[in-house]
């Protein structure tokens, strides 16, 4: 995360670190049930074998993992069938739900986050020299409606209806490499709802170039179907 700040430890208990089997963090993810993690499909391009991946739950530091951290192998990988940048990992054993490891809530199917809704991104990704490398960072960003985001001076028609934009048009705060697959959550009524999966951007934190996130509400039916049938 570029800009933003270091998260209060364990304040985002659904945050997952997706790692190689050798323990190197390369993407984020979101725990959505004890056995399932949602991430970006492009995070799974490294290998078709579930054995190539493992997930870390309940962490704050990227490297020096605390004793309570849960490290779980992956048993299955599911790609969204219409080529969208979203995927599911089934864990080889269920996560133990604690005060530091809690699944995120999914949105209602096809729910549309209102323009300018303030949401949060989190991750251990590239900080581009801003403070907090190696620690879980967070940043608050407003959602930008697709019609605005697709204007010529912004993302110029690149954003699909199955995606959403979030960011400050002045730049300076954004998700970046290593945050991919992680959550964008928005507070609604009394809880945070997972509305986005960190997907892509034109650089990181550039003026007029907001980050792009997969719109989770468009895939709730697929997510629930995969979880139910597997």
């Amino acid at each position: 995360v570029v800009g933003g700040c270091v998260a209060h430890p364990h304040s985002w208990p659904w945050q997952v670190s997706l790692r190689t089997r050798f323990g190197m963090h390369f993407c984020g993810g979101t725990l959505i049930s004890p056995e399932w993690v949602l991430t970006a499909a492009h995070c799974l391009e490294k290998s078709p074998r579930p054995s190539s991946y493992k997930v870390i739950l309940g962490a704050h530091q990227e490297v020096n993992l605390e004793p309570h951290v849960q490290e779980i192998e992956v048993s299955r990988l599911f790609l969204e069938p219409t080529r969208k940048d979203i995927a599911l990992l089934k864990l080889s054993s269920p996560a133990v739900i604690t005060d530091k490891v809690i699944p995120a809530c999914l949105p209602s199917p096809n729910y549309v986050v209102a323009d300018r809704t303030e949401c949060f991104i989190t991750g251990w990704g590239e900080t581009q020299g801003t403070f907090g490398a190696g620690l879980l960072k967070e940043a608050q960003l407003p959602v930008i409606e697709n019609k605005v985001c697709n204007r010529y001076e912004f993302l110029n028609g690149r954003v699909q209806s199955t995606e959403l934009c979030a960011g400050h048009l002045a730049g300076g705060t954004d998700s970046c490499q290593g945050d991919s697959g992680g959550p964008l959550v928005c507070f609604e009524k009394d809880k945070y709802i997972l509305q986005g999966v960190t997907s892509w951007g034109l650089g990181c934190a550039r003026p007029n170039k907001p980050g792009v996130y997969v719109r989770v509400s468009r895939f709730v039916t697929w997510i629930e179907g995969v979880m139910r049938n597997n």
């Epitope: 078709p48 074998r49 579930p50 054995s51 192998e73 048993s75 990988l77 599911f78 790609l79 080529r83």
Partner: antibody
Framework: EVKLLESGGGLVQPGGSLKLSCAAS????????MSWVRQAPGKGLEWIGE????????NYTPSLKDKFIISRDNAKNSLYLQMSKVRSEDTALYYC?????????????WGQGTSVTVSS | DIQMTQSPSSLSASLGGKVSITCKAS??????ISWYQHKPGKGPRLLIH???TLQPGIPSRFSGSGSGRDYSFSISNLEPEDIATYYC????????FGGGTKLEIK
Amino acid sequence: EVKLLESGGGLVQPGGSLKLSCAASGFDFSRYWMSWVRQAPGKGLEWIGEINPDSSTINYTPSLKDKFIISRDNAKNSLYLQMSKVRSEDTALYYCASYCGYSYDALDCWGQGTSVTVSS
Amino acid sequence: DIQMTQSPSSLSASLGGKVSITCKASQDINKYISWYQHKPGKGPRLLIHYTSTLQPGIPSRFSGSGSGRDYSFSISNLEPEDIATYYCLQYDNLYTFGGGTKLEIK
């Protein structure tokens, strides 16, 4: 319906070359890793190698690394196996295989194979 | 590379009976093993993955178990259409097939 159709097999002389093809249909070929597997007469299945969607990573079984070249053309939904310096032990039925169930588990989608005979 | 030793290489059983096949890996494969049924003139058919998870549409007569280096596969209530060669496949690191087990009905 997912289909994998191998072609290009036939009779080839020892020391010769042959290029096998696998035409894919019914799934998003350009998104998936693809593998080649062979079965020599009276023997078991042997994995040859695999290629990732954009051809940037190709893995081979160690013993066949310098003998075979796997490639693909996503625009043509086709997978290829270039065989060189073939010997009699390369006589086999050659299968292409993939992950057609939108999950990466084990190889769950197979063609019916194309037969290669190495003989003078 | 990982070697898979499958046994027996052939077996014969009666209709309605039960058979078991084992595969031993040369190292821990962390349950990343699948089982295939292969009939002449067809491509192999995936039955089980991740040690014990049945593929959709595969009858519960087929089952798998194991951990570490040792894995087994069973078919109960044998039916005529089960005549085939069965293979294990490890996918922990690249892929390696076991040598196969040819099943015949007495």
